[in-house]
């Protein structure tokens, strides 16, 4: 039995997979900040987790996926206010009783030290210093990501 949050995540991911392939993104678009091979957009409005997920989708992007602790630290370095929380693309899967990224993979327990409970309707936020489990209905900011594609010997129009 999938929760409504899980269904929303799956639906949006599937619709993203169905969209036509676009040329590689060579540079970050205006307003997006480059962090290594990603472009990040920090929202300045607030939303529950599923609305944040949907907003990133409309921007042809996804909620932030964090590969490891190193990437977490570099992302946190871009957060300038101690008190502000941002949703990322990780929520608790009730059916699998584990933290699950929106790309379908599970959280490696060594990657993030989460403060708070792992339970139904819990989603993950990050601050300048920590990682928190919050009710998914909490309205906070969020971070979208686009992957930069290294493209060689090809010239594409402006992305």
């Amino acid at each position: 039995q999938k929760s409504s949050i899980e269904k929303c995540s799956v639906d949006i991911q599937q619709s993203r997979n169905k969209t036509t392939e676009r040329p590689g993104l060579l540079n970050c678009p205006i307003y997006w900040q480059q962090l290594r091979e990603k472009c990040l957009l920090f929202s300045h409005t607030v939303n529950p987790w599923n609305n944040s997920l949907a907003d990133c989708s409309t921007k042809e992007s996804s909620l932030l996926l964090i590969r490891d602790k190193d990437e977490l630290i570099h992302t946190q370095n871009l957060i300038r206010d101690k008190a502000i929380l941002f949703w990322i693309g990780l929520n608790f899967s009730l059916s699998e009783k584990n933290w699950k990224w929106i790309n379908g993979s599970f959280l490696n327990s060594n990657d993030l030290e989460i403060r708070g409970d792992a339970k139904e309707n819990s989603c993950i936020s990050i601050s300048q210093t920590s990682v928190y489990s919050e009710y998914c209905s909490t309205e906070i900011r969020w971070i979208c990501q686009k992957e930069l594609t290294p493209v060689r010997n090809k010239v594409y129009p402006d992305s």
């Epitope: 300045h44 871009l78 900011r141």
Partner: antibody, heavy 116, light 107 residues
Framework: QVQLQESGPGLVKPSETLSLTCTVS????????WSWIRQTPGKGLEWIGY???????DYNPSLKSRVTISVDTSKNQFSLRLSSVTAADTAVYYC??????????WGQGTLVTVSS | EIVLTQSPGTLSLSPGERATLSCRAS???????LAWYQQKPGQAPRLLIY???SRATGIPDRFSGSGSGTDFTLTISRLEPEDFAVYYC????????FGGGTKVEIK
């Protein structure tokens, strides 16, 4: 209600640097993008650039080599510097809150004339 | 850069009439990232529409936006005396550019 107020000299000599400050009241400058836009009878409305905290700026490609936008969160202000000005830079300069591409709050504008 | 061309340059109408303003882009505007503003003499522009069709806070429902790709329209269903002004479109899909404006004047 967020309010923005531009301030700075109304007259700048050619080849000098135009400097303007925008003071934000009724809300925090933190966490938002803030832009400068100018308006001339000849070229109409022209976006100059934005600042986000102090970590990110972007400028109109046609002005990039001459523009610097900075922010002072402690004073709730952000500033514009435009170097090597000519008569073509004479315009009404507006500061605005930038909703990542469109502008929901504007200052009332300040006329800057470039003349010797 | 994306060039926005607004037409007509001037629209002469009477209060109560319907106004249809056009904004055409030189290339497709990504994700319908287009906004409309109203400007009165001596004032700053005022945001009316963003995302091609979403009304900004406090904007009356007689203002509506539509379109996608390269063709966008601002419609004022029934002109009120305070609606006579200059209207600008602006795209934010690829850098940021404004149209040249359409003046809506009293006939």
């Amino acid at each position: 209600q967020v309010q923005l107020q531009e301030s700075g000299p109304g007259l700048v000599k050619p080849s000098e640097t135009l400097s303007l400050t925008c003071t934000v009241s009724g809300g925090s400058i933190s966490g938002y993008y803030w832009s400068w836009i100018r308006q001339t009878p000849g070229k109409g409305l022209e976006w100059i650039g934005y600042v986000y905290y102090s970590v990110s700026t972007d400028y109109n490609p046609s002005l990039k080599s001459r523009v610097t936008i900075s922010v002072d969160t402690s004073k709730n202000q952000f500033s514009l510097r435009l170097s090597s000005v000519t008569a073509a830079d004479t315009a009404v300069y507006y500061c605005a809150r930038d909703e990542t591409g469109y502008f929901d709050y504007w200052g009332q504008g300040t006329l800057v004339t470039v003349s010797s | 850069e994306i060039v926005l061309t607004q037409s007509p340059g001037t629209l002469s109408l009477s209060p109560g009439e319907r106004a249809t303003l056009s904004c055409r882009a030189s290339q497709s505007v990504r994700s319908s990232y287009l906004a409309w503003y109203q400007q009165k003499p001596g004032q700053a522009p005022r945001l009316l529409i963003y995302g091609a069709s979403s009304r900004a806070t406090g904007i009356p429902d007689r203002f509506s936006g539509s379109g996608s790709g390269t063709d966008f329209t601002l419609t004022i269903s029934r002109l009120e005396p305070e609606d006579f002004a200059v209207y600008y479109c602006q795209q934010y899909g690829s850098s940021l550019t404004f149209g040249g404006g359409t003046k809506v004047e009293i006939k």
